[in-house]
């Protein structure tokens, strides 16, 4: 029968950044197709990506319903052109994913410095509050909305003329730092979730420097 050529999916891997969440697996299909199911620990299975020849499935719409839940997915393998066919045990071959808890495991995306404004010897640096695909009351929540004070930002800043860095932290999206008058500074930020034990940090933002378009300078 056609089922003898069907192989189970393997290397099921969650790829998730700022809650945009995709399940990936192997192998590339040869004469077979896949369907994915996702469930919370206590919930019912929901099917997604029906009879696909892809080896990935976007599950964002499901996990954003409750990012603090723990999810499990499974990938079913069917013979191409004969999706009603089942394996020797009377059901299609499938493989389970690792468990995935979005709130604890989604990677923090690279942050962006939205603006900086100098007033005398103080600079206010603002980090863009990135929109996620998590919804509440029909509106998309920002990263800060979702994580609240669990999310902090670390600012690295240095004089354009030197390499010696300083750093500051905030549990909002704004920094107010002291600078030397008449000096230009460069800035980079990193997102951190201190309560995590893995995936705690984002990559660093692109560097922004004073004297470029993004900032504003006011001499008081």
């Amino acid at each position: 029968s056609g089922t003898t050529n069907t192989v189970a999916a393997y290397n099921l891997t969650w790829k998730s950044t700022n809650f945009k969440t995709i399940l990936e697996w192997e192998p590339k299909p040869v004469n077979q197709v896949y369907t994915v199911q996702i469930s919370t620990k206590s919930g019912d299975w929901k099917s997604k990506c029906f009879y696909t020849t892809d080896t990935e499935c976007d599950l964002t719409d499901e996990i954003v319903k409750d990012v603090k839940q723990t999810y499990l997915a499974r990938v079913f393998s069917y013979p191409a052109g004969n999706v009603e066919s089942t394996g020797s045990a009377g059901e299609p071959l499938y493989e389970n994913s690792p468990e995935f808890t979005p709130y604890l495991e989604t990677n923090l995306g690279q942050p962006t410095i939205q603006s900086f404004e100098q007033v005398g010897t103080k600079v206010n640096v603002t980090v863009e509050d990135e929109r996620t695909l998590v919804r509440r009351n029909n509106t998309f929540l920002s990263l800060r909305d979702v994580f609240g004070k669990d999310l902090i930002y670390t600012l690295y800043y240095w004089k354009s003329s030197s390499s010696g860095k300083k750093t500051a932290k905030t549990n909002t999206n704004e920094f107010l730092i002291d600078v030397d008058k008449g000096e230009n500074y460069c800035f980079s930020v990193q997102a951190v979730i201190p309560s995590r034990t893995v995936n705690r940090k984002s990559t660093d933002s692109p560097v922004e420097c004073m004297g470029q378009e993004k900032g504003e300078f006011r001499e008081i």
């Epitope: 902090i152 500051a168 932290k169 549990n171 201190p194 034990t197 995936n199 940090k201 990559t203």
Partner: antibody, heavy 117, light 107 residues
Framework: EIQLQQSGPELVKPGASVQVSCKTS????????VYWVRQSHGKSLEWIGY????????IYDQNFKGKATLTVDKSSTTAFMHLNSLTSDDSAVYFC??????????WGQGTTLTVSS | DIQMTQSPASQSASLGESVTITCLAS??????LAWYQQKPGKSPQLLIY???NLADGVPSRFSGSGSGTKFSFKISSLQAEDFVNYYC?????????FGAGTKLELK
Amino acid sequence: EIQLQQSGPELVKPGASVQVSCKTSGYSFTDYNVYWVRQSHGKSLEWIGYIDPYNGITIYDQNFKGKATLTVDKSSTTAFMHLNSLTSDDSAVYFCARDVTTALDFWGQGTTLTVSS
Amino acid sequence: DIQMTQSPASQSASLGESVTITCLASQTIDTWLAWYQQKPGKSPQLLIYAATNLADGVPSRFSGSGSGTKFSFKISSLQAEDFVNYYCQQVYSSPFTFGAGTKLELK
């Protein structure tokens, strides 16, 4: 079990250099900064600087720029502090510690450095 | 740089009493403050983080309060093992300065 194991005591001559190591285990090395702190005999704690193993960024206290150099070896999950041009004022206990952003939650046992001719 | 002024430098107290140590920051640090205990010949041990949060495994007789520039650390019902050194540290901006320390002595 989370551990930070520092290298043993050092007795060196003035003008020499020394390297102190801090071997970490029991946690994801690149997820936490490693801080270095100095304590002279009977004195308070002085922050030397830190290194972020994730991106290699180092931050130093102004008093230790040019004196201390912080590095890591990700493959062995070890942090290093190199101290140069040593004088008797550098005689102290040096600690490494894990930074959880809000505090230093695990510390090495300390490395005693004695600078004497 | 942010200066941390810790007081008192030393304090005598009896078993079962309560003591309070204060740390003043030279500028606002929100709640970016930690408290440590250090026993003779040992490494510091984290007691309180984010000004008010008790670290794992730390007895509930230790507590922290404050935000902005004024912070307090309290030990209620002192035990024999509490008569050691205590330090505050601001972790808001570099350099991440420590207070000068408080030596708690048995009366």
